[in-house]
């Protein structure tokens, strides 16, 4: 048993029938030494009376909050949450398995820039009853310090016939530097709970590896004379990082005709600009990527070629 | 030629070929971003390479002030990394293809470090560490993490030249 | 962010022939070798050609040596499998991947860190 925040403890149990759960001693938190009794949630019903009290937890029903009194009178609460380990392996039934990059990815990060602040998301079919706490560090063992806030509602999405809920925090590391080499991992910690279940999700990644350029703004067309070819141009995103000269984007060029089926025509270039052969109700549409290592590209930017 | 007493590098060539290490390091182990930096075991070969750190002036404002120091550095990571892609972890089985990229990596490290550092003058160099897995898959696996880690290196280098040939080069 | 497209599939005569093509986007395969893998239905995926990144030097599994060929035109992005005498047991969907060095196709490397396409079916039956 371990205490998870003030007067909450999480009991971790090795699940599988008739396993013979854990012994746990509760101690009110009083200097009162007699007629102190304890009773589970909202029941009356006394279980056990002196100033400890042992229980044998093995499921849920012996989980929730405990408290003891004097006199009517409440002295002390302990709120005991399961954390299951089924087979060895902890049980991770509150959030959605998202499958991408690779099984087993419970929670996605990404960050826009070099500057130390990212994003991080996950995906739960529960609506209730449900709470998280994000910790992050640089390092685990000389951990440097990254201030997370709180994890929001960001989308909520029906998939079939069930209702699919994203939550997303912010993070942003207090020394970020954004020019250097990283050599050791952001390390993202999140605790779910929901209802008397624990559970507790890593990830573990260099900002590098994460990031993912906004879309190139102000994608404009100029018709040249007397061609079909057009010049694309566009600009290097707000959010990217700074200077350009040091911190430089790639770029993909794509024409696209109006069926998806018809053959995509791509150009790469390092300038921000590029000229193309514009079809009639094609459109253009261009993304970026670090120029110096292969992180994810950025979202389309798009404009229609007539 | 960034040599004692401060004189420049040749920036554009140092950008041109910075630029085709990122290509042929990427090409050496493409898809990295998707290892799971937990299941990789702490090894100490890729614990002992040399980053480019803070305050190692390879930002932009350090690089203004004095280039010297990062150029260093990077020249001190050329030739760890050099020496690692020469070492009997990648020259062991399993044996590289003979049009390796490995092997064009190899010899570009090598002549960018030969672009920053001319006969006759020395910076300090780091010792390599003296691990050599005794299984393939052991090798295998070491020589990822090593790409890995180089390819993290020479993206921050290639940063460095495209800056300095843009804003540094006379 | 390397994206590989698989065509050329379909259905075929046993001894018949079919030629599948493997389009890169994203990335220049200039420097990369690429590596043919099939999957049968309710079996495991198994290597079966594997071509370096020059074109030169190429790799096959047993069972397909002499029947099978691996080019590539890195003008186009391009990697091909010509796969001729083909039998009912080549029935399979076939994926083509980067395989550095060829290490997956050897045998030596079994890992999910290599970029795959989304696969191409081949049946061959009379």
């Known amino acids: 048993i371990w205490e998870l925040k003030k007067d909450v403890y999480v009991v971790e149990l090795d699940w599988y029938p008739d396993a013979p759960g854990e012994m746990v001693v509760l101690t009110c938190d009083t200097p009162e030494e007699d007629g102190i009794t304890w009773t589970l949630d909202q029941s009356s019903e006394v279980l056990g009376s002196g100033k400890t009290l042992t229980i044998q937890v093995k499921e849920f029903g012996d989980a929730g909050q405990y408290t003891c009194h004097k006199g009517g009178e409440v002295l002390s609460h302990s709120l005991l949450l399961l954390h299951k380990k089924e087979d060895g392996i902890w049980s991770t039934d509150i959030l959605k398995d998202q499958k991408e990059p690779k099984n087993k990815t419970f929670l996605r990060c990404e960050a826009k820039n070099y500057s130390g602040r990212f994003t991080c998301w996950w995906l739960t079919t529960i609506s209730t009853d449900l709470t998280f706490s994000v910790k992050s560090s640089r390092g685990s063992s000389d951990p440097q310090g990254v201030t997370c806030g709180a994890a929001t509602l960001s989308a909520e999405r029906v998939r079939g016939d069930n209702k699919e809920y994203e939550y997303s925090v912010e993070c942003q590391e207090d020394s970020a530097c954004p020019a250097a080499e990283e050599s050791l991992p952001i390390e993202v910690m999140v605790d779910a709970v929901h209802k008397l279940k624990y559970e507790n999700y890593t990830s573990s990644f260099f900002i590098r590896d994460i990031i993912k350029p906004d879309p190139p703004k102000n994608l404009q067309l100029k018709p040249l004379k007397n061609s079909r070819q057009v010049e694309v141009s566009w600009e290097y995103p707000d959010t990217w990082s700074t200077p350009h000269s040091y911190f430089s984007l790639t770029f993909c060029v794509q024409v696209q005709g109006k069926s998806k089926r018809e053959k995509k025509d791509r150009v790469f270039t390092d300038k921000t600009s590029a000229t193309v052969i514009c079809r009639k109700n094609a459109s253009i549409s261009v993304r970026a990527q670090d120029r110096y290592y292969s992180s994810s590209w950025s979202e389309w930017a798009s404009v229609p070629c007539s | 030629r960034a040599v004692p007493g401060g004189s420049s590098p040749a920036w554009t060539q140092c950008q041109q070929l910075s630029q085709k290490l990122c290509t042929l390091a990427w090409s050496a182990h493409p898809l990295v971003g998707h290892m799971d930096l937990r299941e990789e075991g702490d090894e100490e070969t890729t614990n002992d390479v040399p980053h480019i750190q803070c305050g190692d002036g390879c930002d932009p404002q350090g690089l203004r002030d004095n280039s010297q120091f990062c150029l260093q550095r990077i020249h001190q990571g050329l030739i760890f990394y050099e020496k690692l892609l020469g070492s009997d972890i990648f020259t062991g089985e399993p044996s590289l293809l003979p049009d390796s990229p490995v092997g064009q990596l190899h010899a570009s490290l090598l002549g960018l470090s030969q672009l920053l550092q001319p006969e006759g003058h020395h910076w300090e160099t780091q010792q390599i560490p003296s691990l050599s897995p005794s299984q393939p898959w052991q090798r295998l696996l070491l020589r990822f993490k090593i790409l890995r880690s180089l390819q993290a290196f020479v993206a921050v280098a290639a940063r460095v030249f495209a800056h300095g040939a843009a804003t540094l080069s006379p | 962010e390397v994206q590989l497209l698989e065509s050329g599939g379909g259905l075929v005569q046993p001894g018949g022939s079919l030629r599948l093509s493997c389009a890169a986007s994203?990335?220049?395969?200039?420097?990369?070798?690429i590596g043919w893998f099939r999957q049968a239905p309710g079996k495991g995926r198994e290597g079966v050609s594997c071509?370096?990144?020059?074109?030169?030097?190429?790799y096959y599994a047993d069972s397909v040596k002499g029947r099978f060929t691996i080019s590539r035109d890195n003008s186009k992005n391009t990697v091909y499998l010509q796969m001729n005498s083909l039998r009912p047991e080549d029935t399979a969907v076939y994926y083509c991947a980067t395989d550095p060095e060829c290490y997956r196709v050897r045998g030596y490397y079994n890992g999910e860190y290599d970029y795959w396409g989304q696969g191409t079916l081949v049946t061959v039956s009379s």
């Open positions: 071509v370096s990144s020059s074109g030169q030097y190429t």
């Open positions: 994203g990335f220049t395969l200039d420097y990369l070798a």
